[in-house]
Each structure stands twice: as C-alpha cells, then as structure tokens.
C-alpha cells in the first residue's frame, strides 16, 4: 500500500505558499495537472489548472494561486500568494489522465494560516506581490470533471501521522468554473 | 524510523575520484529529492548537488559541477555522488539529506562522511 | 545566486536568556527559508522551515518570523542543549540552495 503524507505549513496571513510538486517527465510532462483542495468530509475540489496540454513555463492565474509547469525540471510550482485565514486546508497536486482517474502527487499539504504580524523590520514579500496582480483581459476555462461511484465516508485526516491507501489515484468532483488568466512579468 | 547511511569517503590525492553511497530506509526513497551537502572543517554548509525522486533531475553547485555526478538507485535505496577531479578544497565532511516532498529543505541528515584530499 | 547573510556570528547569551539570531537574504525568497542546528561532531537538525512552521519534535521555544529577506530565529529560554550553530537556508525558485555562514550560540 502506498502511504499518505503530509507537510505542514504554517503561516502568516499576507505571505506565500510556495510548494514544488515532483512528477515523471516522461509521462507527465505535457499532461494537464491541478492543484486541490480536500475539505472535511468531501471529495478533493479543484481551484486551478494548468493548459490542456501543459505549456513549460507558462505560468496560470486563478485569483491568488498561481500555477507554473516546468516540463524541463519535471515540477509543478504552486504559489498561494496573500494567504489569508480562511485558506487554511489540505491540499494536493494531481495530473488528470483521462480516461483515467487524477493520479496524486506527494506529499499533501497541511496548510495553517494564521493572523499576526509575518514579517520584520526592513521585511518586504509584499513588493513581490505587485507581480500577480490579475491584468483586466480573463480568459474563462474549466478544468476536467472526474466523478466517482465512490464516496467518502471519512475526513482527511488532520494529523501528520502516515495513512494507509490502497493506491496513489484519489477522485474528484464537485469542480467549478474557474477563471484562469496570463501572468505578465 | 527514517536512516542515512553514508560510507565511501576517505584520503585521495589530488585529481583522484571517490564514489561516495547513502543507504536509506525508513521512508519511500522514490519518491523523495535527495540532495549532498558538504562542510569543511571548521567552515560552514555547502550544497552540492540534488536529485529528484520522480522527475530524476539533477543540479550541481558551480564549484563541483562538471566533476562530480549525482545517482540513485531506487531499488537498492541507495544514493550515490561520483567524485572526479578531486581538489584539495573538496576536503569536506559530505552528509546525504532528504527532503521534503514540496521543497528543497532538509529534513533528515545522515552523519556523514569525511573525505580529504590532500598530496 | 542568492547570498544568506547570518547576524551576529558569535552570540554569548545566559541559560534561561533569550536568544536572537538574524538572517538576510540578498533578494526575496517569500517565506522559503529554513532553519537548522549543529551541535559538533553531529550532522545538521532541522528546525524550523516555511520561516515559521517548526519541525517535528522541535520545542516551542523555538521560534521563526520574517518573510521576504529579513528572518529571525528566536530561542525565547536558552537551555543547555541549544548552544550550538545555527544555520539559515533558502529553498526559493531554484538551485543553488544557499546557506548563511551560522551564528555560534555560546555559553556566557
């Protein structure tokens, strides 16, 4: 059995979740892939994904998360810039494979995010922001609905403790229009 | 409980080559980057080279790159750093760490290996 | 490559004081930034990583603040197991992974 993990990550509201998810370049490389959420109880649900097929380095926007596939590199980089409370969660990447299910990349991510002050003096992330800042021109896309017989019967669990799964493919549904957009350096 | 086993260090003179292994176990090898990381006596830490657990790529410091080639073999759970063209400022205790799966961080660090290169 | 630059390099605190330790970086790495301690003769621990988040089993007197180029590691009641090297990493964009030069935690 393959064993779920997470990483924890805790942080302040205001700063940047900045995460690598490693995948086989000879299968995946232009494969379209996502980043999720998995809340209490439901089935993951999909915030973002990349172009079908996958562009290298192109970066995509969706409201604050931003999604760059380097297919050279064989990584996913996703950034959840100006974190806010709320974005507290669980989260994965997966590649959509149809016909087949998403395929999972490890580990999960335990995301807390806290109020409070992030930075020190002379601190400057937020100059970085400036760059995500959504240009006016959208362009309206959706990403793949998988549905599954299965359901949940159980949450995730919030500990880091390992999980016991009897594979590496996890289901999705309950995806919602998403809004994806170019990024301009 | 997760272990890194480094061996294979030792005096070479200059211009020699050294292999140097870190067996692991404790945790899914395949599926996690695994990088080197050296120190000098009494110097401070320096990363030389990474390998990914999916993707296989690999990255190498400026100082070693050209020189020295980073392995693995998933079925063996083995790590390995081939060391050509040793110098007399590649003397440095040489420690394997894995890391996490989102980030090149280390987590854990094997006790490491001395290798000195000296005439 | 982006240089981490550790402050001070040597500090001499009292058990039971609170420690300080400072590092820049020489560009914004966001939150990408970790902490770790040497003990000699021993290999690195990591403790702290996401600028903030500690590591497991890491005690909570160990802490971690910054974002962007300015961190801190802050040690609120120095025990007699934390005097050592501390070392500060950037894990941001891409290799070369970077760390400061440490700061040596010294008995006063």
């Known amino acids: 059995a393959t064993k779920l993990t997470e990483e924890k990550y805790e942080l302040k509201e205001g700063q940047t979740l900045d995460v690598k998810c490693d995948y086989t370049l000879e299968k995946f490389a232009s494969s379209q892939k996502a980043w999720q959420i998995i809340r209490d109880g439901e089935m993951p649900k999909t915030l973002a994904c990349t172009e079908r097929p996958s562009k290298n380095s192109h970066p995509v926007q969706v409201g604050r998360i931003i999604l760059e596939d380097y297919h050279d590199h064989g990584l996913l980089r996703v950034r959840m810039v100006n974190l806010q409370v709320e974005d507290s969660g669980l989260y994965q990447c997966v590649i959509y494979q149809p016909p087949k299910e998403p395929h999972m990349l490890f580990d999960r991510i335990r995301l807390v995010v806290t109020k409070g002050f992030s930075g020190t003096p002379g601190s400057n992330e937020n100059s970085t922001q400036n760059v995500y800042k959504i240009p006016p021109t959208t362009t309206k896309a959706l990403c793949p609905l998988y549905t599954s017989p299965r359901t949940v019967t159980q949450a995730p669990p919030k500990s880091t403790a390992d999980v016991s799964t009897p594979d590496s493919e996890i289901n999705l549904t309950n995806v919602t229009d998403i809004i994806r957009v170019p990024v301009f350096n | 409980e997760v272990q890194l086993l480094e061996s294979g260090g030792g005096l070479v003179q200059p211009g020699g080559s050294l292999r140097l292994s870190c067996a692991v176990s404790?945790?899914?090898?395949?599926?996690?980057?695994m990088s080197w990381v050296r120190q000098a006596p009494g110097k401070g830490l320096e990363w030389v080279s990474e390998m990914r657990g999916s993707s296989g790529s690999t990255y190498y410091a400026d100082s070693v790159k050209g020189r020295f080639t980073i392995s693995r073999d998933n079925s063996k759970n083995t790590l390995y750093l081939q060391m050509n063209s040793l110098r007399v400022e590649d003397t440095a205790i040489y420690y394997c760490a894995k890391e996490f799966s989102s980030n090149s961080l280390f987590d854990y660090w094997g006790q490491g290996t001395l290798v000195t290169v000296s005439s | 490559e982006i240089v981490m630059t550790q402050s001070p390099a040597t500090l001499s605190v009292s058990p039971g004081e609170r420690a300080t330790l400072s590092c820049r970086a020489s560009?914004?790495?966001?939150?990408?930034l970790a902490w770790y301690q040497q003990k000699p003769g021993q290999a690195p621990r990591l403790l702290i990583y996401?600028?903030?988040t500690r590591a497991t089993g890491i005690p909570a007197r160990f802490s971690g603040s910054g974002s962007g180029t300015e961190f801190t590691l802050t040690i609120s009641s120095l025990q007699s197991e934390d005097f050592a090297v501390y070392y500060c990493?950037?894990?941001?964009?891409?290799?070369?992974?970077?760390f400061g030069q440490g700061t040596k935690v010294e008995i006063k």
């Open positions: 560009q914004s790495v966001n939150a990408n």
């Open positions: 996401g600028a903030s």
């Open positions: 404790g945790f899914t090898f395949s599926r996690y980057a």
């Open positions: 990493q950037q894990f941001y964009n891409w290799p070369p992974w970077t």
